[in-house]
Interface confidence: low
């Protein structure tokens, strides 16, 4: 009689990630007798996946009864496969021994390839914000795929990106892989309501790529215009003098007056106007008691936006153009923010 | 075969970091999550995290956050953890253990280190 | 966290013995439940995964068994290379946990 052959008759199978695999096996006669074991991989550091004797195998199923005595089919279902469940894998018959059981012949391999779909893209700018016309960098990853081959495009608005470098890791033979792609974006002044896009196409995908996206007021710091100008005289011996503070992002602002260099008074923008871009709008009052001085006055408005060193704009006032009020000793009141004072 | 090399013992100072290593060898590395697990002296076993060399995506026991830093070196084929403000109670054998990434039962935590020892004293 | 109740901490048996240790889980864990050994000196060497399947080149005489959430591992009949410590280890949820280890001593 012919020795008993073990027949796995697929080289390779392809299965999708969460499907279920069916691996192949028959032996072509019933001697000699004794179980069949599964391995994933051979020699040494070889896996047990299936033993038909003995042990509990939660997501393997066998095709056949293997309790039948004239059953010859020993193929195996493998459910809810992930990437790292690829690799050959091999039906071994063993002869019955006592006490253990011997090694008799194995089946050539079957070789599981998985198809599984990428992890929604994440990206993240840089750790500190930029100003209109620097060169900020943003990088998207996304994880697990397989098979290797992955299309990763960029855009800003819309508009497809060209400066930007990718990698797909490991280099060599792997269960999955990982995709790392850094952008370079310039920014405008404009770019409040920007985003950017990171678009992956994989086949397993079906044509309908993943985005991820970054919103570029996270990344971007628009620093404020100032115009310092002084109103008309609202009463006599006093002046009223306005800071406008234009196109800032974000709102995190703090203004200082000073007259003649010394601090008059501080406050925070809290009450702004968005513009339609995104960027922001303050005024902020100075109420200036001109009697109180006795020489020209230089009012300086000084604003520290997001942390940034503080710019500043002056405006002199002509005290000897306003008559002097005896006896006054207040130079200047707290008037607040625009919200209070509506002259 | 499958081997999990670790680096030699280390005594620190209190206050002071280390940086043990673990080296595989016989399969792909990347296809593998790399735990660690102390064992202080006389004690049980206690698993600090893992890290999977593929995208270098880690996971800690909350317990050792802070304390330990996972990181690797794919073209080493090496798995790392830097252990942070040594105290005389971080002292223990600390060893490195392979799974396979969203495995079948089999594969977990069936290769380990031999094991590193750090003494923590002034 | 899932807590793993090892029992006993020690014993002693003798040669030729049947040696019990149990497992209790906190929750359930299903079958995810390894029994490893632990030798002076030696590297940890796991015996049996997900709960009963028996390692490549370890012995018959181990086996490992469950009710619920209890995990037993039996030694049908100790051998003088068996006096070692023992743990078992949940991979059904991070934190991945251990029992708090049992010593085999010689009796």
């Known amino acids: 009689e012919e020795e008993l052959q073990v027949i796995q008759p697929d080289k390779s199978v392809l299965v999708a990630a969460g499907e279920t695999a069916t691996l192949r096996c028959t032996a072509t006669s019933l001697i000699p007798v004794g179980p069949i074991q599964w391995f994933r991989g051979a020699g040494p550091g070889r896996e047990l996946i299936y033993n038909q004797k003995e042990g509990h195998f939660p997501r393997v199923t066998t095709v056949s009864d293997l309790t039948k005595r004239n059953n010859m089919d020993f193929s195996i279902r493998i459910g809810n496969i992930t990437p790292a469940d690829a690799g050959t894998y091999y039906c071994v018959k063993f002869r019955k021994g006592s006490p253990d059981d011997v090694e008799f012949k194995s089946g050539a391999g079957t070789e599981l390839s998985v198809r599984a779909k990428p992890s929604a893209p994440v990206v993240s700018g840089p750790a500190a914000r930029a100003t209109p016309q620097h060169t900020v960098s943003f990088t998207c990853e996304s994880h697990g795929f397989s098979p290797r081959d992955i299309t990763l495009k960029w855009f800003k608005n819309g508009n497809e990106l060209s400066d930007f470098q990718t990698n797909v890791d490991p280099v060599g033979e792997s269960v999955s892989y990982s995709i790392h792609s850094t952008a370079k974006v310039v920014l405008t002044r404009e770019d409040v309501h920007s985003q950017v896009i990171c678009e992956v196409a994989h086949v397993t995908l079906q044509g309908d790529p993943l985005r991820g996206t970054a919103n570029l007021s996270e990344t971007i710091r628009v620093p404020p215009t100032l115009e310092v100008t002084q109103q008309p005289v609202r009463a006599e011996n006093q002046v009223n003098v306005t800071c406008q503070v234009r196109k800032f992002y974000p709102q995190r602002l703090q203004l200082t007056w000073l007259e003649n260099g010394n601090v008059s008074r501080t406050e925070t923008a809290s009450t702004v106007t968005e513009n339609k871009d995104g960027t922001y709008n303050w005024m902020s009052w100075l109420l200036v008691n001109v009697s109180a001085h006795r020489d020209d006055v230089k009012l300086t408005c000084q604003v520290e936006h997001d942390g940034q060193p503080a710019v500043s704009k002056s405006h002199d006032l002509k005290v000897s153009a306003h008559p002097k009020e005896q006896g006054s000793n207040t130079a200047a009141e707290n008037t607040g923010s625009n919200e209070r004072n509506i002259y | 075969e499958v081997q999990l090399v670790q680096s030699g013992a280390e005594v620190v100072k209190p206050g002071a970091s280390v940086k043990l290593s673990c080296k595989a060898s016989?399969?792909?590395?990347?296809?593998?999550?790399m735990h660690w697990v102390k064992q202080a002296p006389g004690q049980g076993l206690e698993w600090i995290g893992a890290?999977?060399?593929?995208?270098?995506?880690?996971t800690y026991n909350q317990k050792f956050k802070g304390k330990a830093t996972l990181t690797v070196d794919k073209s080493a084929s090496t798995a790392y953890m830097e252990l942070s403000s040594l105290r005389s109670e971080d002292t223990a054998v600390y060893y490195c253990?392979?799974?396979?990434?969203?495995?079948?039962?089999?594969?977990?935590?069936?290769?380990w280190g031999q094991g590193t020892l750090v003494t923590v004293s002034s | 966290d899932i807590q793993m109740t090892q029992s006993p901490s020690s014993l002693s048996a003798s040669v030729g013995d049947r040696v019990t240790i149990t497992c209790r889980a906190s929750?359930?864990?299903?079958?995810?439940l390894n029994w490893l050994q632990q030798k002076p000196g030696k590297a940890i060497k796991r015996l049996i995964y997900?709960?009963?399947s028996l390692d490549s080149g370890v012995p018959s005489r181990f086996s490992g068994s469950r009710s619920g959430t209890d995990f037993t591992l039996t030694i049908s009949s100790l051998q003088p290379e068996d006096f070692a410590t023992y743990y078992c280890?949940?991979?059904?949820?991070?934190?991945?946990?251990f029992g708090q280890g049992t010593k085999v001593e010689i009796k």
């Open positions: 890290i999977y060399p593929v995208n270098s995506d880690t």
């Open positions: 997900a709960t009963s």
């Open positions: 929750q359930d864990i299903g079958s995810r």
């Open positions: 253990t392979r799974s396979f990434y969203y495995s079948l039962d089999a594969a977990w935590f069936v290769y």
């Open positions: 280890l949940q991979y059904a949820s991070s934190p991945f946990t």
């Open positions: 016989g399969s792909t590395f990347t296809s593998y999550w």
